[in-house]
Each structure stands twice: as structure tokens, then as C-alpha cells.
């Protein structure tokens, strides 16, 4: 990996043992200034592998609300607007980091957690041919 | 929102002002035990809107490596294996949280940051008709 020279103005950290506890400023900086995430908000409906978005809420997690995609069909929508079962709608998944309150119900103490979320769906050629 | 009763065993936090600084344990807990993320690892190739994955590395960020999807084609792959420009390959984007070292180069001090990443691609019916 890349070795970064330590900034002498860093906050002091006495405990060098793992599990490593760090200070995190929750005042979020948004780097998405030149891209509009809402631009893709209608893809769930216009896709040949459309999906619905389900709200997953957990007050012990930060962010507390995550939207999960569920593909609407097993197959994909063809040019006639019908479901073609010779193709498969599948979820595109991504591992994301969230903060889990630890100990539970603590406002200022968290643990990093990795969760797998479905972001949307794509249409793929099947590897198992259920439809002759 | 939901009010959570405070756990009396929480670490003490004197500073109640925003920007809020919290303690985060970086020993990641992985909740994806019953899901195999590699299951979807070939979708990028089998999709009708295939994509390539580009490595984005930043040592000042945690995680330092993020994979970005770039759609391979403007159109989508049809049943004959050709690119059909009457349909559009588009990126499915998601806002994710990462930790940015702040001040820079500090190993134990971070700020939450929201970034937009392309996770994969999907095939959509066009709204802008470039192809007659």
C-alpha cells in the first residue's frame, strides 16, 4: 500500500491496538456537486429489467434508511413490452459501509459494518436455461 | 424520527455541538454472511448492457479502493449479439458513505463523505431519440 506521512496536527491517539477506534466527523461532505443522482431516478421504470425500491429502516444504523431494489420480473421486457423468460432480470449488488451504534442506542459510538445492497437490476443471458 | 433511549453504558461525549464527532470502531463487522457477492461477479459480461470495472484508489479515503462501472456501449446488446442503438446502456448509480482523512494524512481522524458511484449498467428505453 501507499505510506502516507503523518500530519503533525493530527488528533492524538493513545490506543494503537485493534480494534482501532477513530474519531469521525458526521458533518457529511457531499462530493457529488457536478453530477445529479436524481438523473437516474426513472431508470427503475424504463429498464428492460425494471425494479421496485423498498425502504429498509433501522434506527441503530447510520444511515438509518437504505433503499433496496427488487427486480419486478424473472425475465426481461422485450420490444413488445412483454416479459421474455429467455433472459433474466438480476439484481446488481454492492457492498457498502454503514455505521452501527455500538453499544446499542449510543448516539456517539459506532462500529463500521459492511452490508450488501441491491442497487438496481440488469438483464443478463441465462447460464441455466429453464426455458426451452 | 424514532427516539432511542440512551444506553447508560455509552462512552461520554462532552461536545454536543455540530459538526458532531463520534467514535467509530474500524474493525468491520460483515453482515453478508449468507450472501455470495461473487455470484453477481459475471453479470458485467453477461448483461445486455455490459460494463467494465475501473479501480479508483485514494489513500486519503476509507475504503481506499472503490470499483467504478463504465458501460461498454452506448446501446444495448440484442439477441444477435450486436449493439442496438435504439436502446441505451446507462449506469446505475448509488450514493455511498466513505471516510475521508481529515486533517489530511491523519490515521485516526476522519470525516464522513458522500460520493456517487456507478455500480453497473442497465438497458433502458430512450427518452432522447438520437437514432432515427
Amino acid at each position: 500500500g501507499i505510506t502516507i506521512p503523518r500530519n503533525p496536527g493530527c488528533p492524538n491517539s493513545e490506543d494503537k491496538n485493534f480494534p482501532r477506534t477513530v474519531m469521525v466527523n458526521l458533518n457529511i461532505h457531499n462530493r457529488n456537486t457536478n453530477t445529479n443522482p436524481k438523473r437516474s431516478s426513472d431508470y427503475y421504470n424504463r429498464s428492460t429489467s425494471p425494479w421496485n425500491l423498498h425502504r429498509n429502516e433501522d434506527p441503530e444504523r447510520y444511515p438509518s434508511v437504505i433503499w433496496e431494489a427488487k427486480c419486478r420480473h424473472l425475465g426481461c421486457i422485450n420490444a413488445d413490452g412483454n416479459v421474455d423468460y429467455h433472459m433474466n432480470s438480476v439484481p446488481i449488488q454492492q457492498e457498502i459501509l454503514v455505521l452501527r451504534r455500538e453499544p446499542p442506542h449510543c448516539p456517539n459510538s459506532f462500529r463500521l459494518e459492511k452490508i450488501l445492497v441491491s442497487v438496481g437490476c440488469t438483464c443478463v443471458t441465462p447460464i441455466v436455461h429453464h426455458v426451452a | 424520527g424514532i427516539t432511542i433511549p440512551r444506553n447508560p453504558g455509552c462512552p461520554n461525549s462532552e461536545d454536543k455541538n455540530f459538526p458532531r464527532t463520534v467514535m467509530v470502531n474500524l474493525n468491520i463487522h460483515n453482515r453478508n454472511t449468507n450472501t455470495n457477492p461473487k455470484r453477481s461477479s459475471d453479470y458485467y459480461n453477461r448483461s445486455t448492457s455490459p460494463w467494465n470495472l475501473h479501480r479508483n484508489e485514494d489513500p486519503e479515503r476509507y475504503p481506499s479502493v472503490i470499483w467504478e462501472a463504465k458501460c461498454r456501449h452506448l446501446g444495448c446488446i440484442n439477441a444477435d449479439g450486436n449493439v442496438d442503438y435504439h436502446m441505451n446502456s446507462v449506469p446505475i448509480q448509488q450514493e455511498i458513505l466513505v471516510l475521508r482523512r481529515e486533517p489530511p494524512h491523519c490515521p485516526n481522524s476522519f470525516r464522513l463523505e458522500k460520493i456517487l458511484v456507478s455500480v453497473g449498467c442497465t438497458c433502458v428505453t430512450p427518452i432522447v431519440h438520437h437514432v432515427a
Partner: nanobody, 123 residues
Framework: QVQLVESGGGLVQAGGSLNLSCVIS????????MGWFRQASGKEREFVAA????????VYADSVKGRFTMSRDNAKNTVYLQMNSLKPEDTAVYYC????????????????WGQGTQVTVSS
Amino acid sequence: QVQLVESGGGLVQAGGSLNLSCVISRRTPSGYAMGWFRQASGKEREFVAAISWIGGGAVYADSVKGRFTMSRDNAKNTVYLQMNSLKPEDTAVYYCNDMPYGLDTTMDDYDYWGQGTQVTVSS
């Protein structure tokens, strides 16, 4: 911020040719496609052509199909527009830009343009 530098424009007679180039000064463009657009005096900016960085397939507006060819050089982060059989109605300022949503990109998705390069076709 991505920087776009277009060049290669000029004054040419009808039936002549020009080759425009556009250099993107960022390690990797944010999108997966690049486009050429043009804006004639007093008219709205319009799509001319687009190309995929990876696949290399290009798409053209009906008005330029068969006359213009778009290509790209990934190593140089540069795209080109070879314009043949030019017509007076091709007179415009030509711009290139990243297409973050490929063919789904609309003019509303842009908040930044380069300075463009003027193409003038005389009859």
C-alpha cells in the same frame, strides 16, 4: 472539474473537410462516452455525434450521418470529429463533452462547457 479543449475549426468551402479534436484534461472522464455538439448563431445547442470510450461504437445525428466520423484515442484522452462534404448549414461553434449517461444524456445534465471551436462553411 474536467477541462475540455476543442481545436481544429476554421473557414472552409462547401464540400471541404475539417478534423476537430478535443482533449479531456482529467485522468479519466467521469462518463463512459463522449459527444460532439454544435450551436449555430441564434439556435439551440444540438447533438452531433457520440462515441463509447470502451466499445468504440459511434452514433450520429441524422443531419451528419455518412459525412462525419467520430473516433477516440483512449491513451491520449482525446476524441476526434472528421467532417467531410461540409455544407453551409454545418456552420456553428462545435463543442465536445463527457456524456455521463451515454445516449440518455440531455443538455440539462451539463453545467460546464469548453470554449468550443468555430467552423464556418462558405458557399
